[in-house]
Amino acid sequence: QGWQAFKNDATEIIPELGEYPEPPPELENNKTMNRAENGGRPPHHPFETKDVSEYSCRELHFTRYVTDGPCRSAKPVTELVCSGQCGPARLLPNAIGRGKWWRPSGPDFRCIPDRYRAQRVQLLCPGGEAPRARKVRLVASCKCKRLTRFHNQSELKDFGTEAARPQKGRKPRPRARSAKANQAELENAY
């Protein structure tokens, strides 16, 4: 149950300008998850550019089961996780662990969800209860977004946290534990 598979399946994304995701459900986000800063690699010499279209980031494919209470999806769903720093396309490796790593020193960019898709899932429940259907919104593509001066420090933290983990649903956890970490496409930082 939970994370069934992780495919280290990176795709380079060269995003378009001026596209924004649909406003997400208004729930809070606890910003407590850790992430690896810069992948542990030393920063490459910064490359200054004003054009977001010159930047790219990776899409990682995750396969997981979704749940609701005691019920679990009959089949796993596959979604994207927007991962890593945004860097000039020509410097960003196309697969993890290969090539040079770049870290911006000037404008601040983040790899964030761009488009979402809704997937209808069938959940199987214990005790002979009828299966139930749900619609989960999954990240369909990622993009680099340049942070403006209007984004404050807490919003910068949101970007970092969100970029490093799945966008919907998590491994089932004890009932009363915080679900805030589930709410990944949240806040208006996007």
Partner: antibody
Framework: EVQLVQSGAEVKKPGASVKVSCKAS????????IHWVRQAPGQGLEWIGR????????EFAPKFPGKVTMTTDTSISTAYMELSRLRSDDTAVYYC??????????????WGQGTLVTVSS | DIQLTQSPSFLSASVGDRVTITCRAS?????IHWYQQKPGKAPKLLIY???NLASGVPSRFSGSGSGTEFTLTISSLQPEDFATYYC?????????FGGGTKVEIK
């Protein structure tokens, strides 16, 4: 901005039917289930059922099949709930709400403003 | 069906009071949500998945519980908190709401 805007109040006679609308904006209605909940005067909330705007499939609370018809017109992002054979105890405020599901939990962050249906002879 | 019983049904309290509302389920459930409703308005999501604050909800609201007993706590009641509160479950079909707790000014 996500919004659900419902049609105005209705006064109907017993035995008649009424159709309440719920217009969605700020999101694609096909991506979410739309639920209907009612509240009789001075009473609590009662779930009626839900509709999948993408394919028209419906689910009802046990007491409502045959009484309620839920439909959608995705071309105008609107969900409808029709109540037939109205009785005085159908007098209530009817709400639509959007079901959100994150892969672990299901909840209703967005609600319409409500439509008062009064059944009186 | 899972019945949700809220207690008390009515509660008189003063500004600044600590208020606790209980929601008991007739069978064990995984989580509940809490909604606040003011007269003439639609319900507003307050706490989701037992213990998580919805956006824009003040931190004086908190939720806890598991199994068959869940609580909503308002640590210091404010004038705008006088309203009716509902719990809701969908761990088991059909979806059900509690009967509501009306918080009135003492």
């Amino acid at each position: 901005e996500v919004q659900l805007v419902q049609s105005g109040a209705e006064v109907k006679k017993p035995g008649a039917s009424v159709k309440v609308s719920c217009k969605a904006s700020g999101f694609d209605i096909k991506d979410y289930y739309i639920h209907w909940v009612r509240q009789a005067p001075g009473q609590g909330l009662e779930w009626i059922g839900r509709v999948d705007p993408d394919n028209g499939e419906t689910e009802f609370a046990p007491k409502f099949p045959g009484k309620v018809t839920m439909t959608t017109d995705t071309s105008i992002s609107t969900a409808y709930m029709e109540l037939s054979r109205l009785r005085s105890d159908d007098t209530a405020v009817y709400y639509c709400a959007r079901e959100d599901y994150d892969g672990t939990y299901t909840w209703f962050p967005y609600w319409g403003q409500g439509t008062l249906v009064t059944v009186s002879s | 069906d899972i019945q949700l019983t809220q207690s008390p049904s009515f509660l008189s309290a003063s500004v600044g009071d600590r208020v606790t509302i209980t929601c008991r389920a007739s069978s064990s459930i995984s989580y509940i949500h809490w909604y606040q409703q003011k007269p003439g308005k639609a319900p507003k999501l307050l706490i989701y998945a037992t213990s998580n604050l919805a956006s824009g909800v003040p931190s004086r609201f908190s939720g806890s519980g598991s199994g068959t007993e869940f609580t909503l706590t308002i640590s210091s009641l404010q004038p705008e908190d006088f309203a009716t509160y509902y719990c809701q479950q969908w761990s088991s079909d059909p979806l059900t709401f509690g009967g509501g707790t009306k918080v009135e000014i003492k």
